[in-house]
Interface confidence: medium
């Protein structure tokens, strides 16, 4: 029972993880405009990894899309491939384990079958989770950077009074988002795993023994009947469910660019 | 067509309150914003603050502290209220039309005179 | 505050020259968002309200004639009238339309000879 709630916890919460990533992916707050220590403007820019946004104060809304290839930045680039595996692996993670779940029966496939399948599920979403996780973290180490670059030559004297201020970006709302839910996408995936420790069929560490009664001949072979039906107690795995997943903290960001040159 | 008209009480004693009422036609308050610019006598114009569409406000920070703008869509009004008057806020009140931001104000009334005496 | 700063602050010229009047910003009207410049000119005929001429630093609003042109990026722009006709008496004022509170330039009186 334990096993089977293990699997479809791992399950649920990869699920959210996947949705989360897709989420994030297609999100236009990758990054928004730092409103701490720069004038008040009337704008409000955001950028996403497929198109740069500006809010304006009377409501209007303007999206561009970066309908460059070859003109974005390599790390740009990176970050953008890196959700989409995520997302590929997680997507087909999700299929497979579907399919492996114990709850659901499909023909006459064995344990060791869902069993395999579960722990395929399983490491896909780990890779998934990492993928998220690794794609957040390398675009949030790319807004770090030009924040400080940024920060540094922030004004540029003209003639002694004109001023450029150039425009800082922050952390926008995706990459929390993102962030949770490759946690979740990862944790989802050590559930599995685990799980499929307590679908494998239990190995047996001597052989069958025959008796021999007079004029019958029967072979009793141990743990046959626990094999063949859905019921056995695994005993040796059973300390490991005791519990279910759990974020630590939910992260709120603020809701308008690095420029890509 | 697009119309603006501002109304006023022409006259008021200092240190009192002033209010002055805008009366749209031609447009929804509710899909365009309303700047107050004032211009006192011979002068150039300032920019006294903006009720947006969506009803957010921003005001001329120097103004801040005695401006209060609100707005009714039912009947198209805005209103522009203004406390503990001065000599210097003598002028000519107007509101515009933004067509929306970044466009410019594209239709203004006519203005409103108002001395402080 | 942004501060607008016009000049020059009054000129005179005949029917039919070219005149250029500047408007210098404090601070950058650039927006990196949209490559917008948030930039108004406005025509203030005596005894009238103002009237819009140009937004976004270079684009004429409708009914306004091809004479009138506007230019420039970031904090140094331009109002060209490409050929004074004896209506364009007025004093012209430049507008930060991007950071609050939106100022006003000191304007640029325009007569006629």
């Known amino acids: 029972m334990a096993v089977t709630a293990c699997q479809g916890l791992g399950f649920v919460v990869s699920l959210i993880g996947i949705a989360g990533i897709i989420a994030a992916t297609c999100m236009d707050q990758w990054s928004t405009q730092d409103l701490y220590n720069n004038p008040v403007t009337a704008v409000f820019n955001y950028q996403g990894l497929w198109r740069s946004c500006v809010r304006e104060s009377s409501g209007f809304t303007e999206c561009r899309g970066y309908f460059t290839l070859l003109g974005l930045p390599a790390m740009l680039q990176a970050v953008r491939a890196l959700m989409i595996v995520g997302i590929v692996l997680g997507a087909i993670g999700l299929l497979v384990s579907i399919f492996a779940l114990k709850c659901i029966r499909i023909g006459s496939m064995e344990d060791s079958a869902k069993a395999n399948m579960t722990l395929t599920s399983g490491i896909m979403f780990i890779v998934s989770g990492l993928c998220a996780i690794a794609g957040v973290s390398v675009f949030a180490n790319m807004l770090v950077t030009n924040f400080w670059m940024s920060t540094a030559n922030m004004y540029t004297g003209m003639g002694g009074m004109v001023q450029t201020v150039q425009t800082r970006y922050t952390f926008g709302a995706a990459l929390f988002v993102g962030w949770v839910a490759g946690g979740l996408t990862l944790i989802g995936g050590v559930m599995m795993c685990i799980a499929c420790r307590g679908l494998a069929p239990e190995e047996t560490n001597y052989k069958a023994v025959s008796y021999h009664a007079s004029g019958h001949s029967v072979a009793y072979k141990p743990g046959g009947f626990k094999a063949s039906t859905g019921f056995g107690s695994n005993t040796k795995n059973k300390k490991i469910y005791d519990g279910g997943a759990r974020t630590e903290d939910e992260v709120q960001s603020y809701p308008s660019k690095h420029d890509y040159v | 067509q697009v119309q603006l008209k501002e109304s006023g009480p022409g006259l008021v004693a200092p240190s009192q309150s002033l209010s002055i009422t805008c009366t749209v036609s031609?447009?929804?308050?509710?899909?365009?914003?309303v700047h107050w610019v004032r211009q006192p006598p011979g002068k150039g114009l300032e920019w006294l603050g903006v009720?947006?569409?969506?009803?957010?406000?921003n005001f001329n920070s120097a103004l801040m502290s005695r401006l209060s703008i609100s707005k009714d869509n039912s009947k198209n009004q805005v209103f522009l209220k203004m406390n503990s008057l001065q000599s210097d806020d003598t002028a000519m009140y107007y509101c515009?039309?933004?067509?929306?931001?970044?466009?410019?104000?594209?239709?203004w009334g006519q203005g409103t005179t108002l001395t402080v005496s | 505050d942004i501060v607008m700063t016009q000049s020059p602050s009054s000129l005179s010229v005949s029917a039919g020259e070219k005149v250029t009047m500047s408007c210098k910003s404090s601070?950058?009207?650039?927006?990196?968002?949209?490559?917008?410049?948030?930039l108004a000119w406005y025509q203030q005929k005596p005894g009238q309200p103002p009237k819009l001429l140009i937004y976004g630093a270079s684009t004429r609003e409708s009914g306004v004639p091809d004479r009138f042109t506007g230019s420039g990026s970031g904090t140094d722009f331009t109002l060209t009238i490409s050929s004074v006709q004896a209506e364009d008496l007025a004093v012209y004022y430049c507008q930060n339309d991007y950071y609050y509170p939106f100022t006003f330039g000191s304007g640029t009186k325009l007569e006629i000879k």
């Open positions: 515009a039309r933004d067509y929306y931001y970044g466009i410019g104000l594209d239709y």
């Open positions: 601070q950058s009207l650039l927006n990196s968002g949209n490559q917008k410049n948030y």
């Open positions: 009720i947006w569409a969506g009803g957010s406000i």
């Open positions: 031609g447009f929804s308050l509710t899909s365009h914003g």
